[in-house]
């Protein structure tokens, strides 16, 4: 049994880190493999993660961690029974992938404006709460070429767009993702998308 692509890990900088890797051939990850992880300091407790399959040769493990802080560094050991397949280390604060924003809502009650709001995925006590910026993807359900990205570089999780910039009588979808500038993170996953119908009509005199 051999590791084809070594584990790479990302942290939500709260309590979960996710490691992914590829094996040399088809593997029942949960039955055959274990990923052991231990905080590098004195004789900290060793934790075990049972991986799941992620495609035929891919494995993924979700490591539960007690309140990740900047000082934490973990050793990682990938075992197949008594055989050590790979040994590495992982510092969560240097490999941050933010949680995805949630509760994306579209407000169309103001006739000429579409207001999108969403929730910050972090509690206010987490440093990332005030460090996130967002990208909002809006697309036409009937024409995937009609798609745009709005970068939200201010802290408030809202975006206002003139309804006139969207085609009238068309259903649109939106989704949002986040990244943290001070930590130079990767982008989060996209939030679930939400749908609305753009019923905006230009005032008669502008037609």
């Amino acid at each position: 049994m051999k590791v084809l692509q070594e584990p790479t890990c990302v942290s939500d900088y709260m309590s979960i880190s996710t490691c992914e890797w590829k094996m040399g051939g088809p593997t029942n990850c949960s039955a055959e493999l274990r990923l052991l992880y231990q905080l590098v300091f004195q004789s900290s407790e060793t934790h075990t993660c049972v991986p799941e399959n992620n495609g035929g040769v891919g494995c993924v493990c979700h490591l539960l961690m007690d309140d990740v802080v900047s000082m934490d560094n973990y050793t990682l050991d990938l075992w197949a029974g008594q055989q050590l397949l790979w040994k590495g280390s992982f510092k969560p604060s240097e490999h941050v992938k933010p949680r995805a924003p949630g509760n994306l809502t579209v407000h169309t009650n103001v006739s000429d404006t579409v207001l999108l709001t969403w929730s910050n995925p972090y509690p206010p006590d987490n440093y990332l709460y005030n460090d996130l910026t967002y990208a909002v993807n809006i697309w036409n359900e009937n024409d995937l070429a009609d798609s745009r990205i709005h970068n939200v570089t201010y802290l408030k999780p809202t975006l206002r767009i003139p309804a006139s910039t969207l085609k009238s009588g068309i259903s649109y979808r939106a989704r949002v993702r986040a990244w943290a500038q001070h930590y130079n993170t990767t982008w989060s996953e996209w939030s679930p998308s939400t749908k609305w119908y753009n019923s905006y009509r230009e005032p008669f005199e502008q037609r």
């Epitope: 590098v40 007690d66 309140d67 802080v69 006590d125 987490n126 440093y127």
Partner: antibody, heavy 121, light 107 residues
């Protein structure tokens, strides 16, 4: 506003024990790691121990490991430091401290006023 | 353990002076460095975190810079209330380690 108030210091003989307490208010106690820092007379600051918020992971300086035990009671909003087998070199002012953010445990934005521990025969 | 070396260990400066205190880490700590001020008989107070971020309520004459192994705390115009001892602290890896302190006196 955040308040931290240490108590439990005093004079103790070498080999003796003390339990320090730190009563906290003004923040969601259970969300933050908490830290003890000490300062010997006329000396600099020394990190002693940290306890994480939810899983209760505990970390200690080598100088106190196996003698000191940090703990917390989230229901009482109180942090503790049980000090056993005390030595003269443990004589210091002991501060409890809270970080600015739950994941930046070393950026200690709030401190108590300290409690004095004297180990002497 | 990461060693933090502060210099100078003490310094005397005049009111209005620009004062610089440096902190050297024994290995790279990225920007995980904080600066604390401790006045006689008081608890320490956080001035700067993340190497350069000013803590809320701290006067803008204080600034921090540096990353990797070399860091600087600068007081741009010294005031009487700045009489204190200053400490750096690395929070890059366990154990947390402080510099030995810099005692700032007013001439």
């Amino acid at each position: 506003q955040v308040q931290l108030q240490e108590s439990g210091g005093g004079l103790v003989q070498p080999g003796g024990s003390l339990r320090l307490s730190c009563a906290a208010s003004g923040f969601t106690f259970s969300s933050y790691s908490l830290t003890w820092v000490r300062q010997a007379p006329g000396k600099g600051l020394e990190w002693v121990s940290t306890i994480k918020a939810r899983g209760g992971t505990t970390l200690y300086a080598d100088s106190v490991k196996d003698r000191f035990t940090i703990s917390r009671d989230n229901a009482k909003n109180t942090l503790y430091l049980l000090m056993n087998s005390l030595k003269p070199e443990d004589t210091a002012v002991y501060y409890c401290a809270k970080p600015l953010y739950s994941n930046l445990a070393g950026d200690l934005g709030s401190w108590g006023q300290g409690t004095t521990v004297t180990v002497s025969s | 353990d990461i060693q933090m070396t502060q210099s100078p260990s003490s310094l005397s400066a005049s009111l209005g002076d620009r004062v610089t205190i440096t902190c050297q880490a024994s290995q790279s700590i990225s920007s995980y460095l904080a600066w604390y001020q401790q006045k006689p008989g008081q608890a320490p107070k956080l001035l700067i975190y993340g190497g350069s971020r000013l803590q809320t309520g701290v006067p803008s004459r204080f600034s921090g810079s540096g990353s990797g192994t070399s860091f600087t705390l600068t007081i741009s115009g010294l005031e009487t209330e700045d009489l204190a001892t200053y400490y750096c602290l690395q929070d890059y890896s366990w154990p947390l380690t402080f510099g030995q302190g810099t005692k700032l006196e007013i001439k």
